[in-house]
Interface confidence: low
């Protein structure tokens, strides 16, 4: 009779994680008598997966009834496959011996590869904000996928990016893999509402890629532009100077007024106007009692934005010769109008200016007397 052959018809089997894998094995003869065993790997380090003779293998079931007379099918099914189950499986026939069974013949092996989905991509941006025209890096990570082949793309507002570098680890063969990609993005002033997207395509996703996103609002700082102007006033001894702080992001902003270099008032931006591009505007104003000054006044609007170094804009307030003549040497305390919402300004503004104006004229008159 021909010598027994161990036939493993499939060289490879690919299974999705969580599914069951069927590993086929058949014998060509009933002789010699003895059990079969399944191993993962070959050589001294091989791992026993199933022993027909003894042992408890809860994840392994036999495809046919092995105790059935004349059975030559020794296929097995392994349930709940994970990436750790990947490897080459050998069906091995043993010959009955005393005291131990002796390995007789092995099948050629079936390579089990496990298809595991990548985890949802996690995109992270820079630790510190950067200003427009600067380049920032975003990273994208995904783990636990198999096989190794994977495609990663970066987009900014739907436009594909090209400046990125991607690594799939580990470098050698493994049960599962991780991908790490770093993209470089040049910021523009309009990027407060922009988004970067990391898109991952893998065989396990059946054409429906995974996406991770990050908002550039977390990475950008748009510094403000300042404009200081004098507003027309009804009262002759009053000057209303405004500081328009425009197109800044994020919100955090502190403004200080200085008169001839001396701090007059500090305030924190509260009621902001949001622009279409996501940046903010804010206005502060300073009411100056001009009759309290003999000389021209340099008013400075100094803004500290998002913890950065202060920027400032100055305005020279001219004191007319008539006012200089009536001025005095007493310490000046500017009459300051609080920065208030637009509605309050419109309703109370004229009344407040009238009161302040009359008071100023009275003070000037009293000083003269």
């Amino acid at each position: 009779e021909d010598e027994l052959q161990v036939i493993q018809p499939e060289k490879s089997v690919s299974v999705a994680a969580g599914e069951s894998a069927t590993l086929r094995c058949a014998m060509t003869s009933l002789i010699p008598v003895g059990p079969i065993m399944w191993f993962r790997g070959a050589g001294a380090g091989r791992e026993l997966i199933y022993n027909q003779k003894e042992g408890h293998f809860p994840r392994v079931t036999t495809v046919s009834e092995l105790t059935k007379r004349n059975n030559l099918d020794f296929s097995i099914s392994i349930s709940n496959i994970t990436p750790a189950d990947a490897g080459t499986y050998y069906c091995v026939k043993f010959r009955k011996g005393s005291p131990d069974d002796v390995e007789f013949k092995s099948g050629a092996g079936t390579e089990l590869s496990v298809r595991a989905k990548p985890s949802a991509p996690v995109v992270s941006g820079p630790a510190v904000r950067a200003t427009p025209e600067h380049t920032v890096s975003f990273t994208c990570e995904s783990h636990g996928f198999s096989p190794r082949d994977i495609t990663l793309k970066w987009f900014k507002n739907g436009n594909e990016l090209s400046d990125f570098q991607t690594n799939v680890d580990p470098a050698g063969d493994s049960v599962s893999y991780s991908i790490h990609s770093t993209a470089r993005v040049v910021l523009t002033r309009g990027d407060v509402h922009s988004q970067v997207i990391c898109e991952i395509a893998h065989i396990t996703l059946q054409g429906d890629p995974l996406r991770g996103t990050a908002n550039l609002s977390e990475a950008i700082r748009v510094p403000p532009t300042l404009e200081v102007t004098q507003q027309p006033m009804r009262a002759e001894n009053q000057a209303n100077v405004t500081c328009q702080v425009s197109n800044f992001y994020p919100r955090g902003l502190q403004l200080t007024w200085l008169e001839n270099g001396n701090v007059s008032r500090t305030e924190t931006a509260s009621t902001l106007i949001e622009n279409k591009d996501g940046t903010y505007n804010w206005m502060s104003w300073l009411l100056v009692n001009t009759c309290a000054h003999r000389d021209d006044v340099v008013l400075t609007c100094q803004v500290e934005h998002d913890g950065q170094q202060a920027v400032s804009k100055s305005y020279a307030l001219e004191i007319s010769a008539h006012q200089k003549e009536h001025g005095s040497d007493i310490t000046h305390e500017a009459a300051l109008a609080p920065t208030a919402p637009l509605l309050v300004a419109l309703l109370l503004g004229p009344k407040l200016l009238l009161v302040v104006g009359v008071s100023a004229i009275y003070i000037c008159w009293k000083q003269k007397a």
């Epitope: 690594n167 680890d169 580990p170």
Partner: antibody, heavy 119, light 107 residues
Framework: QVQLVQSGAEVKKPGASVKVSCKAS????????MHWVRQVPGQGLEWMGW????????KYSQKFQGRVTITRDTSATTAYMELSSLRSEDTAVYYC????????????WGKGTTVTVSS | DIQVTQSPSSLSASVGDRVTITCRAS??????LNWYQQKPGKAPKLLIH???SLQAGVPSRFSGSGSGTDFSLTINSLQPEDFATYYC?????????FGGGTKVEIK
Amino acid sequence: QVQLVQSGAEVKKPGASVKVSCKASGYTFTSNAMHWVRQVPGQGLEWMGWIKAGNAEIKYSQKFQGRVTITRDTSATTAYMELSSLRSEDTAVYYCARGDYYYYYMDVWGKGTTVTVSS
Amino acid sequence: DIQVTQSPSSLSASVGDRVTITCRASQSISDFLNWYQQKPGKAPKLLIHAASSLQAGVPSRFSGSGSGTDFSLTINSLQPEDFATYYCQQSYSTPLSFGGGTKVEIK
């Protein structure tokens, strides 16, 4: 026994190219990767790239990308490393080393090929 | 890219001493770390692979340990032939990278 035999020393002018060969014997050539590592005189080891001899998958170090080309001829069981646009700082000993497919350790090394770049 | 920092860069020891060289990776690399010995004018020689597996034919006085980011190579009872430069190498991620080397000299 397993061995890697490298081609002889080379002297090249700046801007030229050099091609170093590495003949493998004593093992199944297609079952391993072949790494290329260089060592500038008095300095440490620097990985340049690898080729998986079985499927010709190649990976280069970003530092050499565009200048290095690694190839293999399975029938001749030989790997090649070509470095172009040579500059004086490319003067070094260039090693080929057999690589394991999983941990990517380099268990067998060639004796090295000295490449001198001088005008 | 993963950086591998080796320390010390050099050390002096006597025959019979126990010597330890450390290697730190800039991110976790599991056990994908290998150790090599190089003597002047010679190619490097693999001592340890996968952080702690002794390569065939390497004397048992060499041992490796560690996982994640911190690794070490220990030579128990230093022998005259052990005076050389030792390199660690990470093989977790490309580009593969080597430590700067540790030169073990005779005291």
